[in-house]
Structures are given as structure tokens and as C-alpha cells.
Amino acid sequence: DGNSTRSPETNGLLCGDPDENCAATTTQSKRKGHFSRCPKQYKHYCIKGRCRFVVTEQTPSCVCDEGYIGARCERVDLFY
């Protein structure tokens, strides 16, 4: 519910079309979820990453840029 995932390909699909729903497996949860684009009200939600919306839970989730971690990709990954 707001957990971050890293961006390498192992994370599965990201949404291409702004309005499309897609399935993805996050590295943290290891379960399938359906994602859509985030509402524009969340345009600044993810500090260093991309926002996607967990449709079933109606919550934003961040896919962090490489080298960043945290629910909002707000922390540098010291182990990267």
C-alpha cells in the first residue's frame, strides 16, 4: 500500500498508455496487482521515481529510479 519497487525489468510491466490497466509483480510484495496511471493529483508524489495506481486499493505506489528507495523514493539506496 504505497510500497516502492525498483525499476529493473524484473518488476514486470509498467503502464504505457496513460489510461490502460496492466498487471505487474512488485519485487516487495511478490503478488500480482492491477495498475493504472496515477491521478494527476499525485504528480509530485514520487520524489525519484514513477507513480502508478493500485486499482483495487485505490492507492498510489512508486517505482523508484535506480539508486533510490522508500515509499516515495525519497531515500538514496546506500547499498546500490
Epitope: P39, Y42, P60
Partner: antibody, heavy 121, light 107 residues
Framework: QVQLVQSGAEVKKPGSSVKVSCKAS????????ISWVRQAPGQGLEWMGG????????VYAQKFQGRVTITADESTSTAYMELSSLRSEDTAVYYC??????????????WGQGTLVTVSS | DIQMTQSPSSLSASVGDRVTITCRAS??????LNWYQQKPGKAPKLLIY???NLQSGVPSRFSGSGSGTDFTLTISSLQPEDFATYYC?????????FGQGTKVEIK
């Protein structure tokens, strides 16, 4: 069961300010976004602004920017809406409404009973 | 701002009728749309969230559909307590905006 209880009706003079309160019970007050929506007599619903949890601050509709202030006191589970420089067109029922999300402003699943503010000289 | 336009602005119907109300957004809002019912002197009540999800406690005769810019609220069999005004609301972007409302009256 979540309940939002608003302060009573107000009659104000043009140019003055009004502050309406909204006390929440039965839920985790600080986790949810509280918005203010107004409805002029015989008119539709108009969102004025709201506190956005992930931002930790209020966001306002441009129309009310600089004239409205939305605040919350977590210690008393009460949200406030203050509207200044009142004019006759501000005569309306003012509702507080809770967002269904603990992140942003989504659907308004709980509403206060409304507070009628009448602006008249 | 995202403009929300409802049609019709009012309609007359009888108990048992199937009623359809449409809402159009001025730009694509994906499925970030809610529907409310309001009766005179009362606060609005959430019926449908995220375009098609029925809010808990709302009768199944209410349903919502649509995505992008065009959305529909359907009442499959109108009941006496359904005579009210209905509003759509987008939550894609600030400011949150509502449609102007559709009043459902008794024929």
C-alpha cells in the same frame, strides 16, 4: 461509524470573515483528507479545497485562493474552514467531507450536515 | 480546470423505469470519477466510486460505467426513494470538480 458534526448557521456582513468547524468522531482523523464543498441556494456542488495527507498541507481551488484557509487540529479531531472578504455570492451551505483515501482526495464517503452561511448587510 | 458536463440537466421518469445519466469530462480522467445522490436539505451521498464500484450499502440497482471522458450512471429500476439530484465528480486533478447535476423527477 464515522460522523462529521459541523458548527451552526452564521449570518455575516459583507467584508467580514466566517470560520466553520467540523468535528470528526469514530475514525482516525489525521489519516484522511478533509475537504470543504459549498452549495449556493438552488445550485450545484463546488469544491473549495482540502487538506491532502501525503502533502501535509491544504490545496485550494483557484477561485478561493487567498480568501480561504483550511486547517485541522488533530488534538480535537476538528477541521476548520475560514472564508474572508465575504460577499453576498458566498451565501451557501458549506459542507465538510472526508475523502475515502488516506493519501489524496478521492471520493467523499462521509459528509457533515452542512452549515448555512448567509451574507447580508 | 477539468470541466464536468452532465446530461440531461433534468428528467422525468416513473417508478420501475430504467434511467441513464451521462457525464462528460473536458479531458481524459481515466476512471477517476465518482457519483453522488443528493436529496433536498441533505448532504450528498456517495453511490459509485472509481467509475464503476458500488459504495457499501448502496442498492445494486445503481451501476456506473465508462472510462476516459464518457461516463454513465444507470438506475436499473427506479424506486420512489431515488427521486433526487445526481452529481458526478472527478478526482484526477486539483481542483476537484463536479458536474452541474441531474434532477430526477416523478413523471
Amino acid at each position: 461509524q464515522v460522523q462529521l458534526v459541523q458548527s451552526g448557521a452564521e449570518v455575516k456582513k459583507p467584508g467580514s470573515s466566517v470560520k466553520v468547524s467540523c468535528k470528526a468522531s469514530g475514525g482516525t482523523f489525521s489519516s484522511y483528507a478533509i475537504s470543504w464543498v459549498r452549495q449556493a441556494p438552488g445550485q450545484g456542488l463546488e469544491w473549495m479545497g482540502g487538506i491532502v495527507p501525503w502533502m501535509g498541507e491544504a490545496v485550494y481551488a483557484q477561485k478561493f485562493q487567498g480568501r480561504v484557509t483550511i486547517t485541522a487540529d488533530e488534538s480535537t479531531s476538528t477541521a476548520y474552514m475560514e472564508l474572508s472578504s465575504l460577499r453576498s455570492e458566498d451565501t451557501a451551505v458549506y459542507y465538510c467531507a472526508r475523502s475515502s483515501s488516506t493519501y489524496g482526495i478521492h471520493a467523499f464517503d462521509y459528509w457533515g450536515q452542512g452549515t448555512l452561511v448567509t451574507v447580508s448587510s | 480546470d477539468i470541466q464536468m458536463t452532465q446530461s440531461p440537466s433534468s428528467l422525468s421518469a416513473s417508478v420501475g423505469d430504467r434511467v441513464t445519466i451521462t457525464c462528460r469530462a473536458s479531458q481524459s480522467i481515466s476512471n477517476f470519477l465518482n457519483w453522488y445522490q443528493q436529496k433536498p436539505g441533505k448532504a450528498p451521498k456517495l453511490l459509485i466510486y472509481a467509475a464503476s464500484n458500488l459504495q457499501s450499502g448502496v442498492p445494486s440497482r445503481f451501476s456506473g460505467s465508462g472510462s476516459g471522458t464518457d461516463f454513465t450512471l444507470t438506475i436499473s429500476s427506479l424506486q420512489p426513494e431515488d427521486f433526487a439530484t445526481y452529481y458526478c465528480q472527478q478526482y484526477d486533478d486539483f481542483p476537484m470538480t463536479f458536474g452541474q447535476g441531474t434532477k430526477v423527477e416523478i413523471k
